[in-house]
């Protein structure tokens, strides 16, 4: 398991990132609106 | 905490065929595009394969375009390499990456 | 593909003393959102690579603060403040940009 190895100075990472720049869009947080006369209500 | 395990490694004659499996743990794997790298003894990193996030996607260069294919269930968190007509060049140990976080590695010997 | 060219390939240090490696991008490596996907690994012997640096100058979860990022463009360096032993092994600028994701060819760094 060398990934999780304690060596002195790091730590077990927790965070995952966006890594790659194609996953920009699909990482957004997802919008959910109804369109009512033109404006969009979030619901 | 975000884990990625390799399996599938192994001595396999020229020819031969091995499917690699990734399992993923720890984040919304469905989310993320996803690579398999290889290390040859005492060289650099070179990728074999990436698909992004969905699986319509997918790249290889040409030293296994043909005789590799990466896919991945998503509803198993799991990603996969199948790997076709192996030759003794493609003795490396195979990485699982989400480019942040790394499996620890799978030994592929391709040898007679 | 974007070719990733590290300078230099083996670096000698001191204990306790300043390092700096260099990398540099055939194309630039700025996306849509403004961001540019370079990032640095560490591969200790025996080891997976370990991100270090994300998106040029941002220290991944558990990095020491003794490593810095920075660069624009095409342009880009890796300074380590004052090296210590558990420094040593190779380190890779790679690019996730564009596709494919891509590596430099590793500076190795060894304690004089």
């Known amino acids: 398991d060398a990934e999780f190895r304690h060596d002195s100075g790091y730590e077990v990472h927790h965070q995952k990132l966006v890594f790659f720049a194609e996953d920009v869009g699909s990482n957004k947080g997802a919008i959910i609106g109804l369109m009512v006369g033109g404006v969009v209500i979030a619901c | 905490e975000v884990q990625l395990v390799e399996s599938g490694g192994g001595l396999v004659q020229p020819g031969g065929s091995l499917r690699l499996s990734c399992a993923a743990s720890?984040?919304?794997?469905?989310?993320?595009?996803m690579s398999w790298v290889r290390q040859a003894p005492g060289k650099g990193l070179e990728l074999v394969a990436q698909?992004?996030?969905?699986?319509?996607?997918?790249y290889y260069p040409d030293t296994v375009k043909g005789r590799f294919t990466i896919s991945r269930d998503n509803a198993k968190n799991t990603l996969y390499l199948q790997m076709n007509s192996l030759r003794a060049e493609d003795t490396a140990v195979y990485y699982c990456?989400?480019?942040?976080?790394w499996g620890q590695g799978t030994l592929v010997t391709v040898s007679s | 593909d974007v070719v990733m060219t590290q300078s230099p390939l083996s670096l000698p240090v001191t204990l306790g003393q300043p390092a700096s490696i260099s990398c540099r991008s055939s194309?630039?490596?700025?996306?849509?959102?403004?961001?540019?996907?370079l990032h640095w690994f560490l591969q200790k012997p025996g080891q997976s690579p370990r991100l270090l640096i994300y998106?040029?100058?941002n220290r991944f979860s558990g990095v020491p603060d003794r490593f810095s990022g920075s660069g624009s463009g095409t342009d880009f360096t890796l300074k380590i403040s004052r090296v210590e032993a558990e420094d040593v092994g190779v380190y890779y600028c790679?690019?996730?940009?564009?596709?494919?994701?891509?590596f430099g060819q590793g500076t190795k760094v060894e304690i004089k």
């Open positions: 990456a989400s480019g942040d976080y």
């Open positions: 720890g984040f919304t794997f469905s989310r993320y595009s």
């Open positions: 698909i992004n996030s969905v699986g319509n996607s997918t």
């Open positions: 194309q630039s490596l700025i996306y849509s959102d403004g961001n540019a996907y």
């Open positions: 998106k040029v100058s």
């Open positions: 790679s690019q996730s940009t564009h596709v494919p994701w891509t």
